[in-house]
């Protein structure tokens, strides 16, 4: 099966790499604009230059193109704890990230929030914190893992999953209760 191509891809595929078909004259292949520039005017004829202009401040193109406008630079989302790793240039978008000892949690494909890496108090680090993943903790005896925090088994209710991990503690508590009723 031949993959479906959009009109623009169909037009581009007729020309050699680095060129595109003139929108008004499909016998002419124009040279694409370099990254950092955009298409101001199509080439007037074969072998003639495409009129490309540099992106204005606050905009960019990251690859060769025949876009009529540059793309707007992204802004890092302060409300999600993001910080600017590198600022926007004419040929590269803003790079946003998190502070040291934080990781990215992606709510959707293009939206992330920064959270502090877990410290594994009352436990040990099983896997270190990564750019896109929180620390994985292993809890000491007498503690169980809840939302990636080591919580005392005294907070374990019988109905919860922690009962298996905290069984000795629960039995001890039960035994104490029973001995008090005789």
């Amino acid at each position: 099966l031949v993959p479906h191509l959009g009109d623009r891809e169909k037009r581009d595929s007729v020309c050699p790499q680095g060129k595109y078909i003139h929108p008004q004259n499909n016998s002419i292949c124009c040279t694409k604009c370099h990254k950092g520039t955009y298409l101001y005017n199509d080439c007037p004829g074969p072998g003639q230059d495409t009129d490309c202009r540099e992106c204005e401040s606050g905009s960019f193109t990251a690859s060769e193109n025949h876009l009529r406008h540059c793309l707007s630079c992204s802004k890092c989302r302060k409300e999600m704890g993001q910080v600017e790793i590198s600022s926007c240039t004419v040929d590269r978008d803003t790079v946003c990230g998190c502070r040291k000892n934080q990781y990215r949690h992606y709510w959707s494909e293009n939206l992330f929030q920064c959270f502090n890496c877990s410290l594994c108090l009352n436990g040990t680090v099983h896997l270190s914190c990564q750019e896109k993943q929180n620390t994985v903790c292993t809890c000491h005896a007498g503690f169980f893992l809840r939302e990636n925090e080591c919580v005392s088994c005294s907070n374990c209710k019988k109905s919860l999953e922690c009962t298996k991990l905290c069984l000795p503690q629960i039995e001890n508590v039960k035994g104490t209760e029973d001995s008090g009723t005789t």
């Epitope: 989302r77 302060k78 409300e79 949690h105 929030q113 959270f115 502090n116 939302e147």
Partner: nanobody
């Protein structure tokens, strides 16, 4: 008792508009981000839009950009979602929620309001 109560959902024709409201009580509404998420039939949760505590920074999923507008009125403890040019694919239960600050997840959820876009 914490409550988030959504309203404003209903049946609307494609191209139509609705305004969802979320009345908050039982917590300090003006502190922190608020978010609208939705769940289409048989699908997972989708983050639709969020707004910061001051109402200055907003975010929209690509699927709703240019059609939906989020806003909040901290004096009325209310979050809004203005939905224009509605499409069949916007059909979902819409929830307002308060995201946690310390880890992924939500402190509070509403019960949801159903939006059905159909001719």
């Amino acid at each position: 008792e914490v409550q988030l109560l959504e309203s404003g959902g209903g049946l609307v024709q494609p191209g139509g508009s609705l305004r969802l409201s979320c009345a908050a009580s039982g917590f300090t509404f003006g502190n922190g981000n608020m978010v609208w998420v939705r769940q289409a039939p048989g699908k997972g949760l989708e983050w639709v839009s969020h707004i910061d505590e001051y109402g200055t920074n907003t975010y929209y999923a690509d699927s709703v950009k240019g059609r939906f507008t989020i806003s909040r009125d901290n004096s009325k403890n209310t979050l809004y979602l203005q939905m224009n040019s509605l499409r069949a694919e916007d059909t979902a239960v819409y929830y307002c929620a308060k995201p946690r600050n310390d880890r992924p997840g939500f402190d509070y959820w509403g019960q949801g309001t159903l939006v059905t876009v159909s001719s």
